[in-house]
Interface confidence: low
């Protein structure tokens, strides 16, 4: 003897990403010689048994048996969200509800507010915005592999009344190590299923030069050829180098090249050499003390910087 529940259809709630496909499945144990029917939130019949009732090519029959009616809706739009009803026309009519939730996919975030020509110790503020999410997405910031703590995500309803625009800003003080770094804004949302949707802004930081003097070869001997490389670092790269030898007036040489060449080392070349590397951000002077000894022993040489 069948219980009343055996004629009660059952279904389940479904969540689908906008543009995706959702399958609505309705089952019943005892159909009492009646057909199952699906209708949409506007109470329009979609399928009655295997018969299509609504002319919408997105809606297709998946399974129609006395005990099951399954349909698929492809290219789901936000407007398709709502309660779908499965009915069986027994006495009395029995229904089951399937709540279809459509997720709005957030758009690729947009970063604004970057000002070029940032200088070391300047404060940078970047803004990030992403539209189209439902429910509202969350934004996170990072600099390279390091997380940046931006302000809490602001949420604003889109004009369609269904999706949201989220925005966040981050403020940080830049250092010379940040030159060339990527500031990344990522949007986190269940519709992305863990996929990364982010935008990066590479920043340029202008900073004062540094320099060091590198001898080539590292242990020069009398009679050898020696190059003193003044290795300038900075942004912009040093454009001008002033070489001078302590006690030598005027300075040895002003050059746009960073190397000082000794074609044939003499003892008289011994002394302390200074290289001033200059860019439009400032100057830096490096020192190198050269001791030219006899050809056989390895001469002592030292380098100091400030």
């Amino acid at each position: 003897n069948l219980s009343q529940d055996d004629s009660q259809p059952w279904t389940s709630d479904e969540t689908v990403v906008a543009g995706g496909t959702v399958v609505l499945k309705c089952q019943v144990k005892d159909h009492e010689d009646s057909s199952l029917q699906w209708s949409n939130p506007a109470q329009q019949t979609l399928y009655f048994g295997e018969k299509r009732a609504l002319r919408d090519n997105r809606i297709q029959l998946v399974t129609s048996t006395p005990h099951e009616l399954s349909i698929s809706i492809s290219n789901v739009a936000l407007a398709d969200e709502g309660e779908y009803t499965c009915s069986i026309f027994t006495m009395p009519v029995r229904t089951a509800k399937s709540l279809v939730t459509v997720l709005g996919i957030p758009q690729k975030p947009i970063i604004t507010g970057y000002k070029s020509s940032l200088r070391e110790k300047d404060t940078a503020t970047l803004n990030c915005q992403s539209s189209g999410s439902k429910p509202a997405a969350r934004l996170t910031w990072r600099k390279g592999d390091q997380e940046l703590h931006g302000e809490p995500t602001r949420i604003q309803e889109d004009p369609n009344g269904k999706t949201f625009t989220v925005s966040s800003s981050v403020t940080f003080q830049v250092t010379r190590e940040d030159d060339g770094a990527s500031i990344v804004c990522s949007v986190n949302h269940e519709s992305l299923k863990g996929a990364d949707r982010s935008t990066s802004q590479r920043i340029e930081v202008l900073y004062t030069p540094t320099a060091m003097i590198r001898p080539d070869p590292p242990h020069p001997r009398e009679g050898q050829k020696l190059l003193l490389h003044c290795e300038g670092r900075g942004n912009p790269v040093p454009q001008q180098y002033l070489w001078e030898k302590e006690g030598s007036v005027p300075p040895l040489k002003m050059t746009q090249e960073s190397a000082l060449i000794f074609p044939f080392l003499n003892k008289s070349d011994s002394g302390t050499y200074g290289c001033t590397a200059t860019s439009n951000m400032g100057s830096y002077k490096a020192y190198y003390t050269l001791n030219v000894n006899d050809p056989s022993p390895v001469p002592s040489s030292s380098s100091t910087y400030h």
């Epitope: 070029s116 020509s117 590479r202 340029e204 202008l206 190059l227 942004n235 912009p236 050059t255 746009q256 090249e257 960073s258 190397a259 000082l260 060449i261 860019s279 439009n280």
Partner: antibody, heavy 119, light 113 residues
């Protein structure tokens, strides 16, 4: 007339060596950075190496580092490219070119010299 | 290394018509301290060495006809020939000299339709 003329190309076996020369005339050679650029048959242009005006700064593409050496003799207005450990894929026309810092484009080119590496 | 990508690979244009060649760099070649784009355009005719047309992305080399112009900034650049002449048939290359190794685009072959 401002002119660059390359020489020294030819046929060489894999593993062999060649020295290319580039003779400059019509301008103050010692005031310009110089470059070597190559072009394999039917292919595009590929930068090889550069040398600063006084010869103290040199930079080369990774594919020639340790094999090719660029040098210059400002007294003779000559640019050189010493090519060692040559490989079949080094087969190309080799051009020397002038690179003025005020433009940073290569404004004067030689006619090129053909290097063929084959056994 | 900075990768330079030209489009199209080949182009056929009628005499007197406009020809446009695009060049994209994999990273910006704009140097903020002097606001210059380190990009040049060259023309190469069969059996000849390349000829410098444009440097700093938009400065015409002396002696180059004014129908040749360069534009763009950062990563996207364009060489335009406003009215194609028969002698413009050649392969055109863009090149960055922002950082070594200096790299060229793969070339665009320009023909007459």
């Amino acid at each position: 007339e401002v002119q660059l003329v390359e020489s020294g190309g030819g046929l060489v076996q894999p593993g062999g060596a060649l020295r290319l020369s580039c003779s400059a005339s019509g301008f103050t050679f010692s005031g310009y950075w110089m470059h070597w650029v190559r072009q394999a048959p039917g292919k595009g242009l590929e930068w090889v190496s550069q040398i600063s005006s006084s010869g103290t700064i040199i930079d080369s593409a990774d594919f020639v580092k340790g094999r090719f050496a660029v040098s210059r003799d400002n007294a003779k207005d000559l640019l050189y490219l010493q090519m060692n450990s040559l490989r079949a894929d080094d087969t190309a026309v080799y051009y020397c070119a002038r690179g003025p810092l005020a433009k940073n484009g290569f404004d004067i080119w030689g006619q090129g010299t053909m290097v063929t590496v084959s056994s | 290394d900075i990768v330079m990508t030209q489009s199209p690979d080949s182009l056929a244009v009628s005499l007197g018509e406009r020809a446009t060649i695009n060049c994209k760099s994999s990273q910006s070649v704009l140097y903020s301290s002097n606001n210059k784009n380190y990009l040049a355009w060259y023309q190469q005719k069969p059996g000849q060495p390349p000829k410098l047309l444009i440097y700093w992305a938009s400065t015409r080399e002396s002696g180059v006809p004014d129908r040749f112009s360069g534009s763009g900034s950062g990563t996207d650049f364009t060489l335009t020939i406003s009215s194609l002449q028969a002698e413009d048939v050649a392969v055109y290359y863009c090149q960055q000299y922002y950082s070594t190794p200096y790299t060229f685009g793969q070339g665009t072959k320009l023909e007459i339709k």
